[in-house]
């Protein structure tokens, strides 16, 4: 039996010799060299080698426990002469012993944390974590202890958990806001010789309301004319607060004084200033000076800091009223009026009112400041202040009209007042939705019916408020005859779908689709937009290859070289057919190909009447130029194309120089093809058309099953096709037998 225990090996061995692992030994080993020890498994022959005579195992390379802690190997002892096993194959383990070769690594290089200022000692700030790749089950190589290198006496760290806490009472943000703390993580339980890593923790003190507002001065003085209407700002006062954010927000109030009911104070949220405003109409003749007590306070107070004193401060405000010879006073500081954009000329929008505040009560007249209404869109009744339109409006051109109205004392024209008028033009649905962009799209010739080729979007100049509701449809004149349909997606978009299988760019290269877009607003508005759809040749993945109509219907599009090549091709074909027919007549009439599946020889025998109209009509130079574009199922060319809406033909491309090369290539292929009879080469050069029900005669038997085609119609084709009719008319009965 085998005689060994588990083997252990220290990682990261740096000696010059191979590291000795242990010895495999069988009690069958007599020491005469008759036994051979074999090692297999993890790293055998590479990391671990064995002396096949003695069974001594050595490690050839430095091993890293963190990479692989255990190696599982198999030992064999075989008779050196016979190769037969002396001992059963046995599995053994080499365990790699850990050394402290990895330092703790923090999960982050830099931590950021916040803690409120004035926090109690021991308040949690953040927890840092370091991991050590060494073996946590053996020794202290992976036992991490945390300590603070920088940041005392403000913060401390729990050695076991890495939790950072505040260590100093009453840390004040207003004094210092940012702290940089350096934490060390050391293995070996923090003992000497341990490996360490550090991380930086940026700690920010967040604000608490620990500072009250304070006025920089105890007394303020302002002047205001007696004519100041209610709401007029008289002056600004400002208390300062060392806190930030909502803790620095200040509310101002008038707490005392003789002018309590005459004035108001409001807080400017932007600047945190107190604005003293007039609350009631002042009268110099009645009272010339007012003294107020104004208080500034924090609305957000933290009860635990109330011991720091009241979170408010007071100041005295003295207001002196000035005597004025007052101009007319408008009933409002500004007027906001509204009018619909479809308002007729002379429609009254609203009115303004002003009066002389003096005891004389002089009458007033009104006018529009023409500098603010250069286009003279508005007018005012000079007597009663009614504002009316003098021109038609358009909200889509201008939504707001800001004009100024002047009120002047008739008896004293120097005394005048101005007031702003903000006139909002209300939307009327007077604009039709229209396409969001110009749509030119493409359809592949091989496209299937109901295929989405373009998504349409619309825009409307009218006020969308919270959204438009558009619908899309084909214009009535195109709806019945169109080769495409519109699918309204009911989400303000629509799709253009193909209506049929396959398009022929030689018949129609471009379609213009008139699409009607309407809103469901009131009154409904609509417009007709045109979508251009171009028919293109595409590859099997639907990628466009060519969008030019290249067909014989445009002979002008062919170069002289191309025409010569076509004529040459036709001559060669005719000569080939004639020669072949002549040779056949001289030969003994035996079938060229015995198989019933290939009946081309019969076709040649009886196809002596020449090409018919359909054949010549079907010949398409476009196919020669782009053989990949040939469709599996060609559309008939002897049928008048259905009516198309607004067809637009594009001129045929003139670059037919590659036709000659293509024909020569096909000629060469067929000339060197031993299996292709010459008469069949016609099919290689041009598509023969599908005008007749039978497709091309050269493919009568090319269908997938014999039962796919019915040739009874051949008998209707007259005496010339009698032989064919006889041959194929009764094929079904042959097959049954």
């Amino acid at each position: 039996s085998w005689m060994w225990n588990q083997f252990f090996l220290l990682e990261e061995y740096t000696g010059s010799d191979y590291q000795y692992v242990g010895k495999l030994h069988s009690d069958q080993d007599r020491g005469d060299g008759s036994l051979k020890y074999i090692l297999s498994g993890d790293g055998a022959g590479d990391l671990f080698i064995i002396n096949e005579n003695t069974g001594d195992i050595q490690a050839t390379k430095r091993l890293d426990r963190e990479e692989k802690p255990v190696y599982i190997l198999r030992a064999q002892a075989v008779n050196r002469r016979t190769g037969r096993p002396v001992e059963p194959e046995s599995e053994f383990i080499i365990k790699i012993h850990d050394i402290n070769d990895n330092e703790p690594i923090f999960t982050k290089d830099v931590y950021t944390a916040t803690v409120p200022e004035m926090a109690d000692v021991g308040t949690f700030v953040v927890q840092v974590t370091a991991t050590d790749a060494d073996d946590p089950t053996y020794g202290n190589s992976a036992k991490v202890v945390y300590s603070i290198l920088q940041g005392q006496p403000y913060f401390s760290v729990e050695s076991e958990t890495g939790i950072i806490k505040t260590a100093l009472l009453n840390m004040d943000r207003e004094n210092r806001e940012q702290y940089q703390v350096v934490i060390q993580a050391k293995d070996m339980g923090g003992q000497m010789g341990g490996l360490s890593g550090t991380t930086t923790v940026n700690i920010t003190l967040t604000d608490v309301n620990d500072n009250p507002p304070r006025f920089p001065q105890s007394t303020y003085q302002f002047k205001t004319p007696e004519s100041s209407p209610p709401g007029t700002p008289i002056g600004r006062i400002k208390a300062s607060d060392a806190d930030v954010g909502e803790n620095a927000e200040i509310e101002y109030s008038i707490t005392d004084g003789e002018g309590h009911e005459m004035f108001d104070v409001i807080t400017d949220q932007e600047t945190q200033e107190g604005i003293i405003t007039v609350k009631k109409l002042l009268d110099f003749e009645k009272k010339k000076v007012y003294t107020l007590k104004v208080e500034a306070s924090n609305p957000h107070v933290e009860p635990r800091f109330l011991y720091l004193g009241p979170f408010k401060d007071s100041a005295t405000v003295r207001i002196v009223v000035d005597d004025v010879d007052e101009p007319p006073v408008f009933s409002k500081l500004a007027y906001i009026l509204q009018i619909r954009e479809d308002a007729r000329i002379n429609t009254t929008i609203g009115s303004v009112a002003a009066q002389d505040p003096d005891a004389a009560r002089n009458p007033v007249k009104y006018s529009v400041d023409r500098h603010t209404d250069m286009d003279r869109i508005f007018n005012i009744d000079s007597g009663n202040g009614s504002i009316f339109t003098s021109k038609l409006l358009d909200r889509e051109t201008l939504l707001w009209h800001n004009i100024t109205v002047i009120a002047t004392e008739i008896n004293n024209p120097k005394q005048s007042s101005r007031v702003p008028l903000y006139i909002k033009v209300l939307d009327v649905n007077d604009n039709a939705p229209e396409f969001a962009e110009f749509y030119e799209t493409f359809v592949c010739e091989k496209a299937k019916a109901d295929q989405l080729i373009q998504t349409l979007r619309a825009v409307d100049k009218d006020d969308p408020y919270s959204g438009h509701q558009f619908s899309f449809s084909l214009a009535p004149e195109a709806a019945s005859s169109s080769n495409f349909t519109i699918q309204d997606n009911k989400d303000n978009t629509a799709g253009i779908l193909t209506r049929k299988n396959g398009y022929n760019r030689h018949e129609m290269s471009t379609y213009l689709l008139p699409v009607v877009i309407s809103d469901n607003d009131y009154p409904v508005q609509s417009s007709t937009g045109t979508v251009t759809v171009r028919v293109c040749a595409c590859d099997h993945h639907g990628n466009m290859q060519s969008c030019h109509a290249e067909a014989l219907i445009h002979p002008t599009g062919l170069s002289t070289g191309a025409l010569v090549a076509i004529l040459l091709c036709i001559v060669i074909l005719l000569v080939t057919v004639v020669l072949f027919a002549a040779l056949r007549r001289q030969r003994k009439k035996e079938p060229l190909i015995i198989s019933k599946e290939d009946i081309r020889d019969n076709i040649v025998s009886y196809n002596d009447e020449g090409g018919g109209e359909e054949d010549t009509q079907a010949f398409d130079i476009g196919t020669l130029r782009n053989p990949e574009a040939m469709e599996d199922s060609k559309s008939r060319r002897d049928i008048v194309p259905e009516a198309l809406f607004l067809p637009r033909r594009t001129p045929t491309a003139r670059d037919n120089t590659d036709v000659r090369d293509f024909i020569n290539q096909r000629l060469k292929e067929n000339d060197t093809d031993p299996t292709a009879p010459p008469y069949d080469s016609l099919a290689t050069y041009a598509y023969e058309g599908t005008g007749s029900v039978a497709d091309s005669l050269s493919s009568l038997e090319s269908v997938t099953t014999d039962g796919d085609q019915d040739y009874d119609y051949l008998s209707d084709w007259g005496p010339r096709f009698k032989k064919l009719a006889d041959m194929y008319g009764g094929m079904d009965s042959d097959k049954d037998s």
Partner: antibody, heavy 116, light 107 residues
Framework: QVQLLESGGGLVQPGGSLRLSCAAS????????MSWVRQAPGKGLEWVSV????????YYADSVKGRFTISRDNSKNTLYLQMNSLRAEDTAVYYC?????????WGQGTLVTVSS | DIQMTQSPSSLSASVGDRVTITCRAS??????LNWYQQKPGKAPKLLIY???TLQSGVPSRFSGSGSGTDFTLTISSLQPEDFATYYC?????????FGQGTKVEIK
Amino acid sequence: QVQLLESGGGLVQPGGSLRLSCAASGFTFSSYAMSWVRQAPGKGLEWVSVIRSSGSSTYYADSVKGRFTISRDNSKNTLYLQMNSLRAEDTAVYYCARGGGYFDYWGQGTLVTVSS
Amino acid sequence: DIQMTQSPSSLSASVGDRVTITCRASQSISLWLNWYQQKPGKAPKLLIYAASTLQSGVPSRFSGSGSGTDFTLTISSLQPEDFATYYCQQYYTSPYTFGQGTKVEIK
């Protein structure tokens, strides 16, 4: 799903007033023009009034102009029809409907009877 | 105001029949015509808008055609649930007006 629920109908004397409400749910009410359509007993449909999505523009059939007022509160998703100076010929089922041209969703209707 | 005239006023048909209802406008309304279905005691339901666009959720046996002054609603194969009154409505110009209705009854 889209729901429109009218309320406020009932019996009223000629010359009286009534306010109809239509509570909308299941769609963004503020995006759509809204309409009122009525149907006198045994008769066909008659368009009454429409209000645009923002409420900025309102329109009325000649038969109700000056007597009826359409309004909306987009924050409450509610459409209103204030009917004053009611006449016997205003007796009908009043439907609120979504849309300003084609009415793709309708409420179940509320009956207004004007009779002495 | 634009007058909308529907014909016939009523018709009797059997399940599976092809039914055609026409609507004529007193002046051209382009394609701004809707078709509604109304069953007794119920609110109308939009079938077709813009003359030929099928409202979502409406069976494909309903179709609309026409433009200008003459419009047609066709039910290709009448189903039991299709017996109702059908109204056309123009929204070409204010005030929007409805046809007087066509009642489709069981034969």
